[in-house]
Interface confidence: low
């Protein structure tokens, strides 16, 4: 199953499938989590250690019982991939390093005026994947403001330097935020000239493409087909990359079809998985196991829940069954693909789903009317479980934010509903930025049950909570997918990045805004929240956030919607936006709905609404 | 021109140490696989070592693991052998090659050779 | 490992002969079979790939067939730069092996 926890001052000894630089834990484990054979990571931060070479290093590990000992070392972080995790599985990454040089072939210097403006030319230069960026108070004035635009042959940075007022951080492509746009051309009977930068077996074009979107320096691609003259360069996906970033010429040969890296796609990427079976074909490989199952789709199953395995071969040869089971060759190899792919056989092959975004129709746990006052814009993608819920009568209009917990659940305030509890009004709006966006033609969902929290009485401000079933489930998407709950009662963790966000006020008496809004706000101790709140109950069952001195804080339009909390590089939903005195005033905290207090009731409705668990926990 | 050019070579007594350096021109280095494999007096080759474009990964021949280590420094084109405990078995003359991906692994370009010479 | 083995190990032949060098393998390459020439005194170099794709300079003179296990390099009519010890190399599988050679001498 999928397991998310860290582990602090830890270091998993042996295993070791390869080594890089990485600024930090979450992206050593997602760099773990898009490794074919990496199971376990393990990070040396800057602090950990004195020798320089192993500052930053993250090391994918591999171990065929899915465990390795753990060695004490004071600052490592530890943990395991992501393979199986669903929709925590992302190439994404948007963080920023403070004080960080990563450093690479730097292949381009501008001018430019802020970070952000440099990772977004990062995002829009084809070949770039890193970049750093000197600010004003940079020590040599020559420097200051340089973007430098970057890459390496791994996609990770050759070293990486503590250094005063330098920025680093990485492309955007993989967030799907590349403006670039992609070409989804598939070109028959062509091949495509330049360097090749790996060479894998895939069973069609598709899957060579996927792997290609993926792949750090692949821009392009030529697949030879499996009647391709040559019978050893048959299902021969070449990886291929130029100086130009574009083919420099282009060979008109039967048999072969070349094609582009999907990286550069704006708002969707293919999932990093491939689910099509293929009929007829075996897939050769290392054999990790063979078991007999009922049908290739077992077999899949069976494959994608072994997380070791990468593809199988389902075995319809008379001797390799018994009954109405079949053998299921369940293999793997070093590059992930297939050693050799062979036709016209008894079996049918495919892939492990073990990288698919979908994962299963689960709400997502971890072991993590009222809008934003003093808030920023947010971007394409930052926080892709707001929806908005808004209600057609005669006009449609935003009333209340949300929380998308799962493929068909999303969680909200219980106030929302007040007087207007028909399901039938009601349509929600998910992986959006812009309100302005909405037309009459932007698809929304439409909510099959609205379910209150027994105890909710109106305009009382106990359990505000309430779950929203959806007609139909919802695709996950880099802009649409769930945040993780946090554990059932969760009291130690110390949380101290939390935001707030939505599309509500952004002063008392104000509208709802356009863009997304975004607040980061600080975590009040009930005991402080009471002291401002002398004339209500503030129960174990609420968490307060906002500024002693006002200024920043949720507001009307913003009810239901999320308090998120980033902890050990994971998003959890701590707070569900629910009341407060006015908005942002001095000393009036914002009123929040503990989550975490809720979770045997989110488990219970979740689950009985189906008759089958809804939640799994990664931990 | 493309060229791959080994260096470090000479003779060293037996648990000695020796580093070959290979300096490559003429190509895009950091694109490529490289690797190490050596040829003993009037004997065949013999695959030694390999590292990955990144220097992330690498892999060695059961003859030589935990006695050698492959490294290379992409900014200076240059691909490292660092031989350690060195065996009268090890004389050879160490060739640094190109890997190249279209016909299952293979060697596309190679370096004119530096002798290794193990003996007391 | 996957063991390769050339035969004959060396033979003499004129200008002009068909000359043919066989290579087989311990276990099923499928295609991955290269060929190497290799002259005294220099680095081998890359004749053929994938069994019969020939290298870019090298001469049509120089064929390969095969696939499994049993392969076959052939000189259609040796010439006088011909004269040099060839490899065989299976790259299905790490570690790569190569052949025990075969040196093609001046009858």
């Known amino acids: 199953g999928c397991l998310t926890q860290l582990y602090e001052n830890a270091f998993f000894r042996g295993g070791d499938v390869a080594s890089m630089y990485t600024p930090n834990a979450q992206y050593c484990q997602m760099r773990c989590t898009f490794h074919p054979r990496c199971l376990l990571f393990s990070f040396l931060p800057a602090s950990s250690i004195n020798d320089m070479e192993k500052r930053f290093g993250c090391f994918l590990k591999d171990s065929v019982t899915g465990t390795l000992p753990k060695v004490h070392r004071t600052g490592a972080v530890s943990g395991h991939s992501l393979k199986q995790c669903g929709h925590q599985i992302s190439a994404c990454h948007r963080d920023i390093y403070k004080g960080v040089d990563m450093r690479g072939v730097n292949f381009n210097v501008s001018k430019v005026s802020s970070v952000e403006e440099c990772q977004k030319r990062c995002t829009s230069n084809i070949r770039c994947q890193f970049f750093s960026y000197a600010t004003q108070t940079f020590h040599k004035a020559e420097y200051r403001n340089n973007c430098l635009l970057k890459y390496s042959p791994g996609g990770t940075p050759t070293a990486i330097k503590v250094l005063s007022n330098v920025e680093s951080g990485f492309s955007l492509k993989p967030c799907a935020l590349s403006e670039i746009g992609c070409h989804m051309n598939i070109f028959q009977h062509l091949a495509f000239s330049d360097v090749d930068v790996a060479r894998v077996l895939t069973p069609d074009a598709f899957v060579c493409r996927t792997i290609c979107t993926y792949h750090p320096n692949c821009l392009f691609f030529t697949f030879y087909t499996n009647v391709w003259k040559i019978e050893s360069q048959r299902n021969v996906c070449l990886l291929k990359t130029s100086e130009s970033g574009t083919p420099s010429s282009s060979t008109p040969q039967e048999n072969t079809i070349s094609g582009y890296s999907l990286l550069t796609c704006k708002r969707t990427l293919p999932e990093p998985c491939h689910s099509k079976i293929y009929p007829g074909v075996d897939f050769g490989g290392e054999e990790l196991n063979v078991t007999f199952v009922k049908g290739v789709n077992v077999c899949q199953e069976t494959c994608t829940k072994m997380i070791r395995c990468q593809f199988f071969t389902y075995s319809l040869l008379p001797e390799d069954c018994k009954e109405e089971k079949c053998k299921c060759f369940l293999r793997l190899s070093m590059d992930g693909s297939p050693t050799r792919i062979a036709y016209g056989t008894q079996g049918s092959s495919g892939y492990s789903l073990r990288l698919c975004n979908t994962g299963d129709n689960s709400v997502c746990t971890t072991k993590t009317s009222t809008r934003i006052v003093g808030g920023t814009n947010s971007s394409w993608g930052e926080w892709p479980w707001q929806v908005s819920l808004q209600v057609k009568l005669t006009a449609q209009r935003h009333l209340c934010g949300g929380s998308l917990i799962g493929h068909q659940w999303v969680l909200t305030a219980a106030h929302c509903f007040d007087g207007l509890p028909l399901q039938d009004v009601w349509r929600i709006y998910s992986g959006i930025l812009n309100l302005s966006d909405i037309t009459k033609d932007t698809p929304f969902s439409q909510i099959k049950e609205i379910i209150i929290h027994q105890n909710y009485k109106v305009s009382e401000g106990n359990h505000d909570i309430a779950l929203i079933k959806l007609q139909a489930p919802l695709n996950y998407t880099e802009f649409q997918k769930p945040i993780c709950l946090p554990s059932k009662g969760d009291t130690s963790t110390i949380y101290t990045n939390c935001w707030v966000t939505g599309w509500g006020f952004s002063k008392e008496k104000g509208e709802i805004q356009n863009i997304l809004q975004k607040v980061n706000i600080p975590l009040v101790t009930n005991e402080e929240c009471q002291k401002r709140y002398q004339d209500y109950k503030i129960t174990q069952r609420m968490v307060c956030a906002g500024y002693k001195e006002g200024g920043k804080d949720a507001c009307k339009g913003d009810s239901g919607g999320p308090l998120v909390c980033k902890h050990n590089g994971m998003w959890r939903l701590v707070g569900i936006t629910s009341w407060g005195e006015g908005c942002a005033r001095r000393e009036q905290p914002g009123v929040y709905t503990k989550v975490a207090e809720y979770m045997d009731w989110i488990l219970e409705k979740t689950q009985s609404s189906d008759g089958k668990a809804q939640m799994q926990s990664p931990a | 021109e493309v060229q791959l050019l080994e260096s470090g070579g000479g003779l060293v007594q037996p648990g000695g140490s020796l580093r070959l350096s290979c300096a490559a021109s003429?190509?895009?280095?950091?694109?490529?696989?490289m690797d190490w494999v050596r040829q003993a007096p009037g004997k065949g080759l013999e695959w030694v070592s390999s590292i990955w474009p990144s220097g992330g990964l690498t892999s060695y021949a059961d003859s030589v693991k935990g006695r050698f280590t492959i490294s290379r420094d992409n900014s200076k084109n240059t691909l490292y052998l660092q031989m350690n405990s060195l065996r009268a078995e090890d004389t050879a003359v160490y060739y640094c090659?190109?890997?190249?991906?279209?016909?299952?692994?293979?060697?596309?370009?190679w370096g004119q050779g530096t002798m290794v010479t193990v003996s007391s | 490992d996957i063991q390769m083995t050339q035969s004959p190990s060396s033979l003499s032949a004129s200008v002009g002969d068909r000359v043919t060098i066989t290579c087989r393998a311990s276990q099923s390459i499928s295609a991955y079979l290269n060929w190497y020439q290799q002259k005294p005194g220099k680095a081998p170099q890359l004749l053929m790939y994938?069994?019969?794709s020939l290298q870019s300079g090298v001469p049509s003179r120089f064929s390969g067939s095969g696939s499994g296990t049993d392969f076959t390099l052939t000189i259609s009519s040796l010439q006088p730069e011909d004269f040099a010890t060839y490899f065989c190399?299976?790259?299905?599988?790490?570690?790569?092996?190569f052949g025990g050679g075969t040196k093609v001498e001046i009858k």
């Open positions: 190399q299976q790259g299905y599988t790490t570690p790569v092996t």
């Open positions: 994938g069994v019969g």
């Open positions: 090659a190109r890997g190249w991906a279209p016909g299952g692994d293979a060697f596309d370009i």
């Open positions: 003429g190509f895009t280095f950091s694109w490529y696989r």
